[in-house]
């Protein structure tokens, strides 16, 4: 066992001489992003104050390619890198094409309305006039490709002109536009060469030891890894913590059960019920508030102040009133819960599916005519699953080196 341990320690660290270095650098696991849109069936009725009705469309599946660049080894047992992602649509795996039309809330209009609720009436009326002049409405009919990767909208230019610095988009607006062909920030992580217990743990993200999006030190902490590998020799008491730039926060998953993936022993880690709980139900999350119902996390502070919320798909594990407020939602543990299956000896994921939903809080705002009589509601826009499973040559090598070889050595 000590010989096996030595082999593992030697080969999991981030070092060009280690077996797993190339796997860390260019993840050989094929990753897929499956996106499901909530097509709004009754936009006119919503504007009259009726309950929203949605229909899930998809999946629209993209192959996700990741590669690390600007890899710099520092002299404090850390390595810095940028990881770029590109997405390629997979028609054969998708239920529909990128040219499919989806009726969705106009995030720019409805988001701006909620953001301006407490602004002077005059300013809201001017925005109404601006929206009218530009032909902007509360709901829009756009293609999957446009919603994902961006569409030209004169409102983007208007926002940039009159509210400079507020908006990360130039010319085009798309929900996944910032992710494609771009990096998720500069990660500096421990290599484990000098101290294996800290391997993969994030030292800094974009030069920061903590973020300032939230209202408590605990919520602002950058904990865990960058979400791809974890320290070796896990036990059922271990937790799986990682910092997610997309959620602008650290997340902690808990051990659920042991299993086997393609002959390789695994530990399954899942989201605790408290992951998106509000502060009154789970006090440590108070720093993520102001909160609405439990089970959704307000990410407006890191998403250009728009009233956007992150949750499990279909408001799984959230306050039931959220799913009840929208017709067409059916939360289901099997279909909508996220998991990571990790090889506990190495801390390397074998099979995972991270599922999250993005929703928009919308309501009627006095002075902004485009909001009509919309009743306050958290309306799901889409949910996605980022999934990957080890396969082929990588799986074979992994199985041979880390399952077969130790067995042979043991005897």
């Amino acid at each position: 066992p000590s010989l096996i341990k030595q082999q593992v320690l030697k080969n999991v660290r981030i070092d060009p001489s280690s077996l797993s270095f190339n796997m860390w650098k260019e993840i050989p696991i094929p990753f897929y992003l499956s996106v499901y849109f909530f097509d709004v069936m009754n936009p006119s009725e919503i504007l009259k104050g009726e309950k929203p009705q949605v229909r899930e469309r998809g999946p629209y599946v993209y192959r996700e390619f990741r590669h690390k660049s600007n890899i710099t080894f520092n002299n404090n047992d850390t390595v810095s890198f940028l990881e770029y992602r590109t997405f390629q649509f997979q028609p054969s795996k998708s239920h529909g094409s990128e040219s499919d039309y989806i009726v969705m809330p106009n995030i720019l209009v409805l988001g701006a309305a909620v953001m301006m609720e407490n602004k002077p009436m005059t300013l809201k009326l001017i925005m109404t006039l601006a929206f009218t002049t530009l032909g902007e409405r509360a709901f829009m009919n756009r293609t999957v490709g446009e919603i994902m990767w961006g569409y030209k909208d004169p409102l983007v230019n208007l926002i940039n002109k009159y509210f400079p610095g507020m908006f990360p988009f130039k010319d085009k607006f798309g929900l996944f536009a910032e992710l494609n062909n771009s990096d998720s920030g500069l990660f500096t992580v421990f290599t484990g060469v000098q101290n294996i217990s800290r391997i993969h743990l994030v030292d800094k993200w974009n030069g920061l030891s903590k973020v300032d999006f939230w209202h408590s030190d605990q919520c602002n902490m950058i904990n865990g890894t960058s979400g791809q590998m974890w320290p070796p020799f896990m036990t059922p008491e271990s937790s799986l913590e990682f910092y997610s730039p997309e959620a602008c926060r650290s997340m902690k998953l808990m051990y659920k059960e042991s299993g086997v993936f393609e002959g390789i022993p695994t530990y399954r880690f899942v989201a605790p019920k408290t992951l998106f709980a509000n502060g009154s139900i789970y006090p440590p999350n108070e720093g993520f508030c102001p909160c609405l119902e439990s089970g959704i996390q307000n990410v407006s502070t890191c998403r250009f102040s728009a009233p956007l919320f992150l949750s499990h798909p279909h408001f799984l594990n959230a306050d039931p009133v959220l799913a009840e407020a929208v017709t067409g939602l059916h939360p289901n543990q099997e279909a909508h819960s996220l998991f990571l299956d990790i090889h506990p000896v190495t801390g390397i994921p074998m099979n995972c599916s991270v599922k999250l939903q993005l929703s928009l809080y919308m309501k009627s705002v006095a002075g902004i005519g485009q909001t009509g009589k919309i009743e306050p509601v958290v309306l799901p826009l889409l949910w996605f699953a980022e999934s990957g499973a080890m396969e082929g040559e990588t799986l074979h090598t992994f199985y041979t080196q880390l399952v077969l070889m130790p067995k042979v050595m043991h005897y």
Epitope: N118, K119, P120, M121, T122, L123, L125, I126, M127, L129, A130, L158, K161, Y162, F163, P164, G367
Partner: antibody
């Protein structure tokens, strides 16, 4: 070319109500927001309030209790009423068109003197 | 009602650069964009700069605006005699809920 023209009495007695009308020509009153601004002699500008064609108003907190702005879309006009005036209300009163850019068009202004 | 603070006067010789400051707070300049108005003697004000640094068509490019935090400034480079006027900054204010103007600055061309 959009033009604004203020009209109304140039002299108002203390404690009475000041009434002014602004006529908009060369454009529709339904297209923008319309404002009243005043400037006491030798002093700076003070915003009084705005009106939207639908009748929604927004007033300066310091004048809110005494101000009423109304609109007549059929005549392409909007009006200002300021009650219980005192000598401190003596000023040049301007009407203006308000857009996201700011006060983009102004009337030439009308001097209203409060005196007995 | 709160107002934005400007120096009462500024002056320069023809061709010189003159800068006018406008100081506010987080409830106005800090959370809004700033406009500048020029009022020539005996006339109505005219929009000179909008959204901190944008010039409406017809405004010479010697006029420029900027904003940083809770302050803004207007610069006139290459001062000309016809620039002799009163200049006012303006912004939205969240606390009294409306438009507030600066105290005004009289620019004199020496």
């Amino acid at each position: 070319q959009l033009q604004l023209q203020e009209s109304g009495p140039g002299l108002v007695k203390p404690s009475e109500t000041l009434s002014l009308t602004c006529t908009v020509s060369g454009g529709s009153i339904s297209d923008d927001l319309w404002s009243w601004i005043r400037q006491p002699p030798g002093k700076g500008l003070e915003w009084i309030g705005n009106i939207y064609y639908s009748g929604i108003t927004d007033y300066s907190p310091s004048l809110k209790s005494r101000v009423t702005i109304s609109v007549d879309t059929s005549k392409n006009q909007f009006s200002l009423k300021l009650s219980s005036v005192t000598a401190a209300d003596t000023a040049v009163y301007y009407c203006a068109r308000l857009t996201l850019r700011g006060f983009q068009n102004w009337g030439q202004g009308t001097l209203v003197t409060v005196s007995s | 009602q709160s107002v934005l603070t400007q120096p009462p006067s500024a002056s320069g010789t023809p061709g010189q650069r003159v800068t006018i400051s406008c100081s506010g707070s987080s409830s106005n300049i800090g959370s809004s964009t700033v406009n500048w108005y020029q009022q020539l003697p005996g006339t109505a004000p005219k929009l000179l700069i909008y959204s901190n640094n944008q010039r409406p068509s017809g405004v010479p490019d010697r006029f420029s605006g900027s904003k940083s935090g809770t302050s803004a400034s207007l610069a006139i480079s290459g001062l000309q005699s016809e620039d002799e006027a009163d200049y006012y900054c303006a912004a939205w204010d969240d606390s009294p809920n409306g438009v507030i103007f600066g105290t005004g600055t009289k620019v004199t061309v020496l």
